[in-house]
Interface confidence: low
């Protein structure tokens, strides 16, 4: 790569060097209408194009190539440039996203007549030019500079070449070079920011077509979707920014998410965690209701930046505090009244002689004679699944919504025994959106799953209340607090099996049965742990696996559902 | 057409000091370095230091450091340099020029600045 | 910083051809250029790099590297090329080093 001293820039400002970016795509960016790849990143695009006289008999190979590749930038806001260079550089067509004018300029770039002396770096002032000129609203967009020429460069047109090269570089530009024929690739590799940025034809120019689609590749950057797009107001939040070329900054420490809110504040942020397809950043907070933020990108620590058409915007959403006080409050009277009911248990013992055991009751029948439901029963007899104090790391992949994979991964503890039963509860099949997340089958309100769980625990409640009256004290009855009359009998007293450690013979461990669910109660919402329903594969690909360090952990939990 | 037009002769007493102004015109004012060269009656040509207006930050030579303050204003396509703490010694023509880093390829017409109490 | 020495007088016949020179340790031939000044005028761009001329320049100049000594090189000197001619160079701080200057006379 090049030396401090060849990146200097002026009068000696070595460490002027900005270190701008390389960014190279991972994968197209998407699919045109006619099925071939397309590009959809919000960039400046310059094509400087050699038209010396050794040309002469390719320029319509050239053309072609360039006319092929233009067509795959299809971003609205994509802007195009063509310059040609000889014995001087000349700017064909001026920046511009009108695709009418880059018809026109593609039909001025045909017409060309090579011809003169190789003088690439007058093509690179001419891009500088318009790199500094044609700033959009107070900031430079992100420019990418394709650079074709054929044959060697003379000893000083080359040290030309790489001192303008280098002056696109420090403007924010990312310069890739195309080498036909007898092109000298050394050359090229210090012209254009690394041998990756140099694409070599060496079967001749008809063979410029080949490149067309490895070009796309590596020098679309896009911004395709931000999750969530829409975020509470007053919250902080993290957005995954998903698109393509992210990870190939020439420092990945440079790359920051830009929000452009209402069109007018910019703020940037640095984000948690870059890879080549998406970011995760911390988005700001957005006080007010029906805010827009713009999200752009940059590579560069804000040299420049890669627009987009994602939005996001902020909603209302209920606050989740008035819901914590209101259970705390309904915990602590539900904790008095269970106080209140078993306090005659603990000092009123009924000393009474047992009468001998009846008949042995079905284990198929509940104390209400409804069939038991079978659950499974887990051998807990080594707590900590997730490894000694339940603490072994736990990686989890974040799907869209902030829903996670683990679920479904959770590891049992060593040596637990799983016992499935054979009939298991049922519960309706989710139905898949087209968007492969799931949908419970009736419409989801943001109390539906503590309304689930309360109904779950009335439905406990009464079952606790009919077996505890059972053994309240009766008028009449009398007894000590807390002095206990063992009763020497060889059987146990046969009361309603709600204990759950009633085995027939001690196992190695406790062995907990969930309690059986009341026939009317309805199937635990989506988010029960139990059974583990497979969460459909993530849109995103996973983050790094151990995420280095001093970066931000991902969020402890997904966005809050807007309100409805 | 390039084009570094500066200001008028100025004539300053020792100690005083002295801006002179470039105006530049015809090309993109802020992609190139600006320098300035200073030559005294009868005598060779001295750089002084020089600016890349986009940057921001000058560079100056050895002989200036703590006297010359360059800078530029993009607003206007000027450049501007300032010397202090002026000599008898510092009369002389000062010249601008656009400076590619490997030559100075335009330069501005000079500015007379006398020092004489 | 790195000095630049030049011949301080060099004189040539009308139609002749004169090189003056210009030496210095550590010379960066690519960084190296040529002016030409007149009296009461501005400098002139003449040459810059091993030999390459600007646009409007002459070709009876030229310029060439041997080692840490630059030359510049009128071919057919004309009455016009009577002038002050400077050399020019970046030391390894990368600050602008001029020569002392030759005076060309063109007799």
């Known amino acids: 790569m090049a030396t401090a001293e060849r990146r200097a820039l002026g009068i000696g400002f070595q460490w002027l060097s900005l270190a701008t970016l390389v960014l190279i795509c991972a994968g197209q960016g998407g699919r045109r209408e006619d099925g071939g790849p397309a590009c959809y990143g919000g960039f400046d695009l310059y094509f400087i194009l050699d038209k010396s006289g050794s040309v002469l008999h390719h320029w319509n190979e050239i053309y072609y190539f360039v006319e092929q590749l233009a067509h795959k930038f299809i971003s609205p806001q994509l802007r195009m440039s063509f310059i040609v260079f000889s014995t001087r550089g000349t700017t064909l067509m001026k920046l511009t996203e009108d695709r009418e004018q880059i018809r026109q300029g593609l039909e001025e770039l045909q017409k060309v007549l090579p011809g003169g002396d190789t003088y690439m770096h007058e093509g690179f002032e001419r891009a500088s030019e318009q790199i500094y000129y044609e700033n959009r609203q107070g900031y430079r967009t992100a420019s990418v500079i394709i650079a074709l020429t054929d044959g060697e460069l003379h000893e000083d047109l080359f040290f030309y070449s790489e001192r303008e090269a280098n002056r696109s570089r420090d403007l924010g530009a990312i310069v890739y070079c195309v080498g036909v024929k007898d092109f000298n690739e050394t050359q090229l590799a210090r012209i254009a920011d690394s041998k990756d940025h140099v694409f070599p034809v060496n079967d001749g120019f008809q063979a410029l077509q080949g490149i067309i689609h490895s070009i796309l590749k590596k020098s679309c950057i896009e911004i395709l979707a931000a999750e969530p797009s829409t975020i509470c107001a007053g919250e902080s939040f993290q957005v995954v920014v998903r698109g393509n070329g992210f990870r190939h900054a020439r420092n990945v420490d440079r790359v920051l998410c830009s929000f452009k809110i209402n069109d007018s504040v910019t703020l940037n942020e640095k984000p948690f965690s870059v890879e080549d397809t998406y970011l995760l950043c911390p988005a700001p907070i957005l006080k007010e209701v029906g805010m827009k933020a713009a999200l752009q990108v940059s590579m560069n620590d804000g040299l420049s930046f890669i627009s987009s058409s994602v939005i996001i915007t902020t909603t209302h959403c209920s606050d989740g505090s008035i819901l914590a006080i209101a259970l705390l409050i309904l915990f602590l009277l539900l904790a008095l009244a269970l106080l209140w009911w078993f306090w005659p248990l603990c000092c009123t013992v009924i000393i009474k002689e047992v009468p001998p055991p009846p008949a042995e009751e079905s284990e198929e029948e509940d104390d209400d004679g409804l069939p038991k439901k079978k659950w499974p029963t887990v051998d807990a007899s080594y707590y900590g699944g997730r490894g000694v104090g339940g603490i072994k790391r736990m990686e989890v992949r974040w799907g869209e919504k902030g829903s996670t994979e683990e679920g479904a991964k959770l590891e049992k503890a060593k040596n637990a025994r799983v016992k499935m039963p054979e009939q298991e509860y049922e519960f309706p099949e989710p139905r898949n959106l087209n968007n492969n997340m799931r949908r419970p089958s009736s419409p989801r309100k943001w109390y539906s799953p503590i309304k689930g769980k309360l109904d779950a625990l009335w439905v406990l409640l009464r079952k606790g209340y009919d077996r505890v009256s059972v053994m309240r004290p009766q008028p009449g009855d009398t007894g000590r607090c807390i002095n206990f009359t063992r009763v020497k009998n060889n059987q146990p007293a046969k009361y309603p099996l709600n204990n759950a450690y009633h085995t027939s013979s001690p196992p190695p461990a406790p062995i907990y049965t969930p309690p059986p669910p009341a026939p009317h109660c309805p199937p635990p919402p989506p988010s029960a742990p139990t059974p583990p329903i497979p969460s459909p594969p993530s849109t995103l690909p996973p983050p790094p696996q151990a995420p280095p360090p001093n970066r931000a952990p991902p969020p402890s939990r997904p966005p809050p559902r807007p309100s409805v | 057409q390039v084009q570094l037009v500066q200001s008028g002769a100025e004539v300053k007493k020792p100690g005083a000091s002295v801006k002179v102004s470039c105006k530049v015109s015809g090309y993109t004012f802020s992609s190139y370095a600006i320098s300035w060269v200073r030559q005294a009656p009868g005598q060779g040509l001295e750089w002084m230091g020089g600016i890349i207006p986009i940057f921001g930050t000058a560079n100056y030579a050895q002989k200036f450091q703590g006297r010359v303050t360059i800078t530029a204003d993009e607003s206007t396509s000027t450049a501007y340099m300032e010397l202090s703490s002026l000599r008898s010694e510092d009369t002389a023509v000062y010249y601008c020029a656009r400076d590619t880093d490997y030559m100075f390829d335009y330069w501005g017409q000079g500015t007379l600045v006398t020092v004489s109490s | 910083s790195s000095e630049l020495t030049q011949d301080p007088v060099v004189s040539v016949a009308l139609g002749e051809t004169v090189s003056i020179t210009c030496q210095g340790d550590n010379l960066r031939d690519f960084y190296a250029s040529w002016y030409q000044q007149k009296p009461g005028q501005a400098p002139l761009l003449v040459m810059y790099g091993k030999n390459r001329r600007p646009s409007g320049i002459p070709d009876r100049f030229s310029g060439s590297t041997s080692g840490n000594t630059l030359s510049l090189t009128i071919t057919g000197a004309q009455a016009e090329d009577e002038a002050d001619y400077y050399c020019?160079?970046?030391?390894?701080?990368?600050?602008?080093?001029f020569g002392g200057g030759t005076k060309v006379t063109v007799l």
């Open positions: 020019s160079s970046r030391d390894n701080s990368k600050h602008v080093v």
